[in-house]
């Protein structure tokens, strides 16, 4: 059996973040059992976790991971140097910042060391797999009697991120949401002083520096409203 490695030729669906290849399945021997899919996420461009479902194996197997970057100066095959484990079985690999090259095609290969012919190769666009840390330091400023401005910080370059702000009052059953671009500022023009408001924000590595689909975690919520401090009506930020 020969391993098939898919090399993109420009005609693939470039919206896909990975291409998957595996061994031909012309028989049901151990060597042709499909390997689990590897999922990689780059956290705030600080480190990357590539994980797989180790429990999908018919018997506990310490699968090994190799990686390289296609058509680049970093095309030398590298072994995983920091495995992640689930119940003492390999279930992932963690790569550090210096090993992450966002705009080169990342090739990851999973292999069964007991059956070297049993392997699967995926190609990933890492810039589409970045998940930033949640926004921090939410603050509210009262711009006028009825207008609030929400600000926040991110632990990444602002211009690489877009944001989603959600807010609601204690009287609302659902959140109202608003998209915010890299300027990361949100104004609520009409605030009812009799209601208590809750705001939260999440961020995404899109569209300038990548095309990630996954959002960060939500920020801690921040509150404003009828039971807030009367001492300074122009600046009040209370974290839950």
């Amino acid at each position: 059996l020969n391993t098939t490695i898919l090399t993109p030729n420009g005609n693939e669906d470039t919206t896909a973040d990975f291409f998957l290849t595996t061994m031909p399945t012309d028989s049901l021997s151990v060597s042709t059992l499909p390997l689990p899919e590897v999922q990689c996420f780059v956290f705030n461009v600080e480190y990357m976790n590539c994980t797989w479902n180790s429990s999908s194996e018919p018997q506990p197997t310490n699968l090994t991971l190799h990686y390289w970057y296609k058509n680049s100066d970093n095309d030398k095959v590298q072994k995983c140097s920091h495995y992640l484990f689930s119940e003492e079985i390999t279930s992932g690999c963690q790569l550090q910042k210096k090993e992450i090259h966002l705009y080169q095609t990342f090739v990851v290969q999973l292999q069964d060391p007991r059956e070297p012919r049993r392997q699967a190769t995926q190609m990933l666009k890492l810039q589409n797999l970045v998940i930033p840390w949640a926004p921090e330091n939410l603050t509210l400023h009262k711009l006028s009697e009825s207008q609030l401005e929400l600000n926040w910080n991110n632990r990444f370059l602002n211009h690489c991120l877009e944001h989603l702000v959600q807010y609601r009052t204690d009287w609302d059953h659902s959140w109202t949401e608003q998209s915010v671009d890299y300027r990361h500022k949100f104004s609520l023009p009409s605030v009812d002083g009799q209601k208590r408001y809750t705001f939260r924000v999440r961020s995404r590595f899109n569209p300038l520096c990548g095309s990630a689909q996954h959002w960060s975690e939500w920020s801690h919520p921040i509150h404003w409203g009828s039971n807030t401090s009367k001492e300074n009506p122009f600046l009040f930020a209370l974290e839950a």
Partner: nanobody, 117 residues
Amino acid sequence: QVQLQESGGGLVQPGGSLRLSCAASGFTFSSYPMTWARQAPGKGLEWVSTIASDGGSTAYAASVEGRFTISRDNAKSTLYLQLNSLKTEDTAMYYCTKGYGDGTPAPGQGTQVTVSS
């Protein structure tokens, strides 16, 4: 190796215009976002603008928004920055960098923009 060659700077009066260019080689230009940054005399490197790899998205520092326009020609591996309504505070050395401007890729030699009457 990566090479970035900026050009197009010069001396211009306030309110004037310039078009900066950056010729790139040694990497797959069309795969990378590209960034312009600048350094005024005695100051640190300041991010100016970034453009997505396909040119479809752009971002600008508040100080230049509405006056500067970033663009790119992937077929020519060239990055541009159109500077309009120039102010004296725009005087700086302008650099293009590969990527989103995180400070890690070394910029090129730069091109000097001087705004003075």
